[in-house]
């Protein structure tokens, strides 16, 4: 059947009124206020009608579940928890819902869910526990395949007292939860580093997206045991150079992809092994393409093109002769 | 599931020309490197040469035995591989087949077709 | 370019007891700390099937009666207990420089 829209009629200042009629049990095909629902493509779309909370009425069909560009703020514990439970429910998008809050155990009771975009909210405050669901050291395994996060980084002058991308790792890897995910993009997230441990307990991972961040070392991270990645995207990051270590994980990778356009690359003598490295890898995507930012003489120059006596640093002078 | 189903293959005369089809499907082309095999009756496998994926433009490398004569091509539209032979001489007589790269292509080949012989012969 | 030298050319087994094929290269097809050696096994009739990956990774799917070894340019095929199944031409391939190549086969054959 085509899509239809609910019976009732609200103006958009309606999702308070639409909760509370809500609270009565839902009838079997029932579509929430404000919402669009297709039985036959399994879908619900509930897009930019400013909700500020999740429709308790979802019909238990739903397999795929659209939430994109409300105003949700808070997804509290068991925000999906229903009774019967959403058993379905496989795909998730909350993204530009002005989410800044993802409280431990938000996605419970969800057991088909594969698919989960937070995208474009600015969550300030996600909750460790936000994807197991409790604070056991091991969780129960998530079916979770596929998490979405990118852009989720809040404003500078919202961010709690401390580390972004440690709030964002300990929700990845708290009770080993994750285990199955299989694709993980946090692009845009102004990460500087990512925390050594991160890849190591996320080891089905195919598709690891970090684009668009600000990393500037990949030294202390071990790619070793994604023996399954398949796509490594590092473009438009602050990387200078990419050292042995790194290249030789990378290179070892059975199914890897590796995407590392624009980024200000450092043509000195510690380029030189990466240089080496590219002109015979096939690993990475569209290589010929990557150039010099640094130092001023190198910039634009294609990192293909160089040869050895292209790569110099300059000497460091004794103390005696050096000059203020 | 990964398939690759090779056709195009005949009886041809030495110098004249032939094209080779390898259809692909279970898998996203556009991200693999393809490449051609080819063994001659009773004898061991020659590597013909790939084409790049998408993300490294597509490019192509031969061996030199081919150079010149045989281009390696591909409709990505179609998820078809095709291998245009020309000036072909008696000893370009084999079996050939067509062959996935493994996501990283340094690992060679993980899927082959089930081949089409190809026959130069006056 | 790198040839690969392989020996024994045929090798009657009987099945139970072990088997080992060598293949030895013209120069290092190791590449940043991997040898990019791969085992294929061509039944009668048949196209080739991958075995080994990376001169020791075994392919998905394939027993594990077959294992890989070796770096550098020494690289060795073990089949601990042979079965009739496993009868064919093995083919070890470089892809460390193109052109790859493969070596020219063993054949195994029950005794």
């Known amino acids: 059947s085509s899509p239809t829209s609910s019976a009732s009629s609200f103006s958009s200042s309606a999702p308070f009124l639409a909760s509370a009629v809500s609270a009565q049990p839902p009838l079997p095909d029932q579509c929430p206020a404000l919402c669009e629902c297709s039985e036959a493509a399994r879908t619900v779309k509930c897009v930019n009608r400013n909700l500020t909370e999740v429709p308790t009425d979802l019909p238990a069909y739903v397999r795929n579940l659209f939430l994109t560009g409300n105003q949700l703020a808070v997804l509290p514990a068991g925000a999906f928890a229903r009774r019967p439970p959403l058993a379905e429910l496989a795909a998730l998008n909350l993204s530009g819902s002005r989410l800044d809050e993802v409280r431990a155990g938000a996605f419970e009771h969800l057991p088909s869910l594969r698919q989960l975009d937070l995208s474009h909210n600015p969550l300030a405050d996600l909750s460790p526990f936000a994807f197991s669901g409790s604070n056991a050291s091991v969780s129960a395994p998530s079916p979770l395949v596929e998490l979405i996060l990118n852009h989720i980084v809040p404003p500078e002058d919202e961010r709690q007292n401390r580390s972004f991308e440690g709030m964002v790792v300990a929700a990845l890897l708290a009770g080993r939860a994750l285990q199955g995910l299989r694709r993980l993009e946090l692009a845009s997230n102004h990460f500087l580093y990512l925390p050594r441990d991160v890849l190591a307990q996320l080891p089905s991972l195919r598709h690891l997206d970090l684009s668009n961040n600000s990393l500037v070392s990949l030294t202390y991270v071990s790619f070793r045991n994604l023996t399954h990645l398949e796509s490594l995207h590092l473009e438009d990051n602050a990387l200078k150079v990419l050292h042995n270590g790194t290249l030789a994980e990378l290179q070892g990778l059975p199914h890897i992809r590796v995407f590392l356009d624009n980024n200000p690359w450092v043509c000195d003598c510690h380029m030189a092994d990466m240089v080496t490295w590219l002109k015979e890898t096939e690993v990475v995507q569209g290589k010929d393409r990557l150039t010099c930012a640094y130092p001023e003489k190198m910039r634009n120059r294609v990192l293909l093109e160089l040869n050895s006596a292209d790569l110099d640093c300059d000497p460091i002078l004794p103390p005696s002769l050096q000059t203020s | 599931e990964v398939q690759l189903v090779e056709s195009g293959g005949g009886l041809v005369q030495p110098g004249g020309s032939l094209r080779l089809s390898c259809a692909a499907s279970?898998?996203?082309?556009?991200?693999?490197?393809m490449s051609w095999v080819r063994q001659a009756p009773g004898k061991g496998l020659e590597w013909v040469g790939f084409i790049r994926n998408k993300g490294n433009g597509y490019t192509t490398e031969n061996s030199a035995s081919v150079k010149g004569r045989f281009t390696i091509s591909r409709d990505n539209s179609k998820s078809t591989l095709y291998l245009q032979m020309n000036s072909l001489r008696a000893e370009d007589t084999a079996v050939y087949y067509c062959?996935?790269?493994?996501?990283?292509?340094?690992?060679?080949?993980?899927?082959w077709g089930q081949g089409t012989l190809v026959t130069v012969s006056s | 370019d790198i040839v690969l030298t392989q020996s024994p050319l045929s090798l009657p087994v009987t099945p139970g007891e072990p088997a080992s094929i060598s293949c030895r290269a013209s120069?290092?097809?190791?590449?940043?700390?991997?040898?990019?050696l791969q085992w294929y096994l061509q039944k009668p009739g048949q196209s080739p099937q991958l075995l080994i990956y990376g001169a020791s990774n075994v392919e998905s799917g394939v027993p594990d009666r077959f294992s890989g070894s070796g770096s550098g340019t020494d690289f060795t095929l073990k089949i601990s207990r042979v079965e009739a199944e496993d009868i064919g031409v093995y083919f070890c391939q470089q892809s460390r420089k193109v052109p790859s190549t493969f070596g020219g086969g063993t054949k195994v054959e029950i005794k």
């Open positions: 120069e290092s097809v190791e590449f940043y700390g991997t040898s990019f």
């Open positions: 279970g898998f996203t082309f556009t991200d693999y490197y």
């Open positions: 062959a996935r790269y493994r996501g990283n292509p340094h690992y060679a080949m993980d899927y």
